[in-house]
């Protein structure tokens, strides 16, 4: 499966986005840093199948979108950046849904990486309970925008990586 | 690999201005702060201040606020430390270093190999 | 501003030795410490992070514990190689301050 050409585009408008959400300046906020985690493992070279991966970049990308769709989300971050932040994430997971399907069929492929995906969503649930703990501070949503693109990045290492594959 | 390369050193008369500059190449420049880090002759280490190259915020700690000068050009990986107005007593060793920021990853995990200003009359 | 304190502030032991240096912040920095050597003419090098982390290639010999003030950094078996200059450097909040500085000599 070929991802478009604005699937990458849209990768870099979201990573943008992202930078311009920031809300205060980081250099407060050290103390706050947390260990979310990220589940690394699933975002190495490991020998898995394409298929795979992308089932894991669209499960992270759908996490994403949750996470920052939330009521919470919207109080603490810019309206306008918020929505268009939702535009770029849905068109990335429209672009994956059809990949997944194009790789190994509708039916299997939720069931069939399991684990990796679980991984995925357990690790954004660290990320919802640290931000709950901290009453969704502005230092903590500063960290965890911080740790969103970090993130990012490594879903946007792993697609051109399955890119080069090709 | 991840370098951190600073520009050389430098012999400066009192009152002269200067410009040092730190080079990060190996890694994504504008994910991670630059700090600088003095060391005087025969001394310890003082953090004078940090740049987030994205978008060039800065944070200098009280002793080197209004003495010193960082900034970042992002487009060709670089940060600088500058003077306006060198003393004696700016005499040191100085290095770069990088920090993840509010990532969670060690603190200034590399460093550039130092630059020596020397300021005497 | 966050005061670390290092003790002592050089030590001599001999190859093979156990050694121990401590850190104590003004107030409390949870685990947000760093400990750095650094050798003559040298940048320093980061060697444990978050207190008890351990940096990428950095030998096992090397421990950090500790939270809250009061920190270690642990040298089991002291190597030739060891014999320099130990930082802490308390990464909790700016300005960050670093100790003053503890030299390992040859005893």
């Known amino acids: 499966c070929d991802l478009p050409q604005t699937h990458s585009l849209g990768n870099r408008r979201a990573l943008i986005l992202l930078a311009q959400m920031r809300r205060i300046s980081p250099f407060s906020c050290l103390k706050d840093r947390h260990d979310f985690e990220f589940p690394q493992e699933e975002f190495d070279d490991k020998q898995f199948q394409k298929a795979q991966a992308i089932s894991v970049l669209h499960e992270m990308i759908q996490q994403t979108f949750n996470l920052f769709s939330t009521k919470d989300s919207s109080a603490a971050l810019d309206e306008t950046l918020l929505d268009e932040f939702y535009i770029e994430l849905d068109q990335q997971l429209n672009d994956l849904e059809s990949c997944v399907m194009q790789e190994v069929g509708v039916i299997e492929s939720p069931l069939m990486y399991e684990d990796s995906i679980l991984a995925v969503r357990k690790y954004f649930q660290r990320i919802t309970l640290y931000l709950t703990e901290k009453k969704y501070s502005s230092c903590a949503w500063e960290v965890v925008r911080a740790e969103i693109m970090r993130s990012f990045s490594l879903s946007i290492n792993l697609q051109k990586r399955l890119k080069s594959k090709e | 690999e991840v370098q951190l390369v600073q520009s050389g050193a430098e012999v400066k008369k009192p009152g002269e201005s200067l410009k040092i500059s730190c080079k990060g190449s190996?890694?994504?420049?504008?994910?991670?702060?630059i700090g600088w880090v003095r060391q005087m002759p025969g001394k310890g280490l003082e953090w004078m201040g940090i740049?987030?190259?994205?978008?060039?915020?800065?944070a200098y700690s009280p002793s080197f606020q209004g003495q010193v000068t960082i900034s970042a050009d992002k487009s060709i990986s670089t940060a600088y430390l500058q003077w306006s107005s060198l003393k004696a007593s700016d005499t040191a060793m100085y290095y770069c270093?990088?920090?993840?920021?509010?990532?969670?990853?060690?603190?200034?995990?590399?460093w550039g190999q130092g630059t020596l200003v020397t300021v005497s009359s | 501003d966050i005061q670390m304190t290092q003790s002592p502030s050089s030590l001599s032991a001999s190859v093979g030795d156990r050694v121990t240096i401590t850190c104590r912040a003004s107030?409390?920095?949870?685990?947000?410490l760093n400990w750095y050597q650094q050798k003559p003419g040298k940048a320093p090098k980061l060697l444990i992070y978050?207190?008890?982390s351990l940096q990428s290639g950095v030998p096992s010999r090397f421990s950090g514990s500790g939270s809250g003030t009061d920190f270690t950094l642990t040298i089991s078996s002291l190597q030739p190689e060891d014999f320099a200059t130990y930082y802490c450097?308390?990464?909790?909040?700016?300005?960050?301050?670093f100790g003053q500085g503890t030299k390992v000599e040859i005893k």
């Open positions: 270093a990088r920090h993840p920021g509010l990532n969670w990853a060690p603190d200034f995990d590399y």
């Open positions: 190996g890694y994504s420049f504008t994910s991670y702060w």
């Open positions: 740049i987030d190259p994205s978008d060039s915020d800065t």
């Open positions: 107030q409390s920095i949870d685990e947000f």
């Open positions: 978050f207190a008890s």
């Open positions: 450097q308390q990464a909790h909040s700016f300005p960050l301050t």
